[in-house]
Interface confidence: low
Amino acid sequence: AITEAREEAKPYPLFPGPFPGSLQTDHTPLLSLPHASGYQPALMFSPTQPGRPHTGNVAIPQVTSVESKPLPPLAFKHTVGHIILSEHKGVKFNCSISVPNIYQDTTISWWKDGKELLGAHHAITQFYPDDEVTAIIASFSITSVQRSDNGSYICKMKINNEEIVSDPIYIEVQGLPHFTKQPESMNVTRNTAFNLTCQAVGPPEPVNIFWVQNSSRVNEQPEKSPSVLTVPGLTEMAVFSCEAHNDKGLTVSKGVQINIKAIPSPPTEVSIRNSTAHSILISWVPGFDGYSPFRNCSIQVKEADPLSNGSVMIFNTSALPHLYQIKQLQALANYSIGVSCMNEIGWSAVSPWILASTTEGAPSVAPLNVTVFLNESSDNVDIRWMKPPTKQQDGELVGYRISHVWQSAGISKELLEEVGQNGSRARISVQVHNATCTVRIAAVTRGGVGPFSDPVKIFIPAHGWVDYAPSSTPAPGNADPVLII
């Protein structure tokens, strides 16, 4: 990355000595061009072997001058090989070459770590022509270096379909240590060992690490980066950080809080969202999780009726979404509800208990002991029953619904009667003679109509028959009682 200027370093010399062709130091360039970045190499020489006095690549031209004198080999001149500087300083370096004037259209490109630097606006190529040769100086400047500018820079020149490569110029940007790995916040079990890691790099190396716990240094002797701190265990929350030191100074990591896992706080704001005859939908706001994720919650339900046996119903559910529908409750009943949640450490205390009520429901059982008999003198059918047990009425009884079906010679007719809640008998007029009357009764509350009783059948004879007897709800096991008179 080529960054904008903040400070300038001392300039490096453009080239170490005079060029062939008596190039004077006060020559001004006839032409100064920005770096041409569109060029792609056609041929690259292999790197020079170690031990050679000049590590750049050399091109031996195949052409001769008018007098047939062979031209000398072309090579970039030696320049500074290693530049060390601090972050944010400026740097300028160059490569230079003298090219016989017989060559046209020479192009110099800059490369860093094997990749061409395209669009690098701080590269300038200057041409100094003379009688026989042109001195070419390619300068590269970075106005405010950063770590990403570290690397090996070279010049390449394309000439005669071959490439000449300069010696590398190594740029080493030094600065304060830079963290590549910092300690992370953790939630740990009390008195259980855990590790924290800290890693920082230069240059300059080495980088040494000190650990700090609650503003106090943990290790008297620094450790070389990377460093792993093993903490044998904590009994209370602590804040850790690490200091990274090198010759340029010190950098401090972020402070991280190490929390001790504990049982959760009890849930708060337990609320009734919806209530039906046999269920209650509740929600709650979880308490503090004790630095350990909630696993599940327990809803505890007890009857608020002082006459109840005080037993507690337990319903387990997942910790999310802080909602639960409590089912299998009695209608028109009061309940106390509490919520407790657990994490890996244990269960929270129970939330403050809240009072909730179920609504009225339809009765869950039918009237009992239904009996039916024919009162022939008044041409009525008398029906008697016992009301269902109070517990199973699921609300305040408002009456009964009587279904009576008359069947005769393939014709069937159903009639419904509504009866008030007082009393346990009713009288219906005979609808058809020489027919079967089937009676069923259901209890009714404001919550709805309960189940109908088992059918009770009675035969209504033609006029003039005298004897009759009642018909009643069968004993268990008798499926379809019919009393024929």
């Epitope: 959760p264 706080s265 609320s271 929600s283 999780d289 909630f294």
Partner: antibody
Framework: QVTLKESGPGILQPSQTLSLTCSFS??????????VGWIRQPSGKGLEWLAH???????YYEPALKSRLTISKDSSKNQVFLKIANVDTADTATYYC??????????????WGTGTTVTVSS | QIVLSQSPAILSAFPGEKVTMTCRAT?????MHWYQQKPGSSPKPWIY???NLTSGVPARFSGSGSGTSYSLTISRVEAEDAATYYC?????????FGGGTKLEIK
Amino acid sequence: QVTLKESGPGILQPSQTLSLTCSFSGFSLSTFGMGVGWIRQPSGKGLEWLAHIWWYDDKYYEPALKSRLTISKDSSKNQVFLKIANVDTADTATYYCARIYYGTSYRYFDVWGTGTTVTVSS
Amino acid sequence: QIVLSQSPAILSAFPGEKVTMTCRATSSVRYMHWYQQKPGSSPKPWIYATYNLTSGVPARFSGSGSGTSYSLTISRVEAEDAATYYCHQWSSNPYTFGGGTKLEIK
């Protein structure tokens, strides 16, 4: 982008009822986990939480003011309302509404309105 | 109710100094939240759940604490940090704020 904007009468007289409206955008009060609260600040003094309302219509009030406060919402219009009955000069303040961030085990006011100034004066 | 006491009420510091303000609760709270308010502006959430910085808050700020004692620390104060900082608990109704610490830059 979440924004909240308070509106109110500006000036009212002692014993009147103060009605405030918080109009918001960028979130819905029908969505799981959403809540909006009211906070006030007398000039030059600190902040005082007044009330908040959750997406499922549960309401919570500052106990000392509970008898005078009513919070409500119209989720379809993205509005929350606060009424303060029987105001007196001590209710003169800047009133803020703020969205509540509902974390797994914590809550805080994560976006605040710009506030509306209310003066109670005879 | 839980009362939050912030100290000091006014804190003066030079740029570059490290400052710490504290918030003490009369009963234990799960988490402490901190808000920054500048004159004429509404409060901004600054630190939530004791030590988490909200988006855009510089890393020189940090929060810590547990139980009844919490603190907000600025490692190197800058001029833009001048404001009043309020702590706030959401553990027990009423959900109270501290009285604030006003940070002045010399």
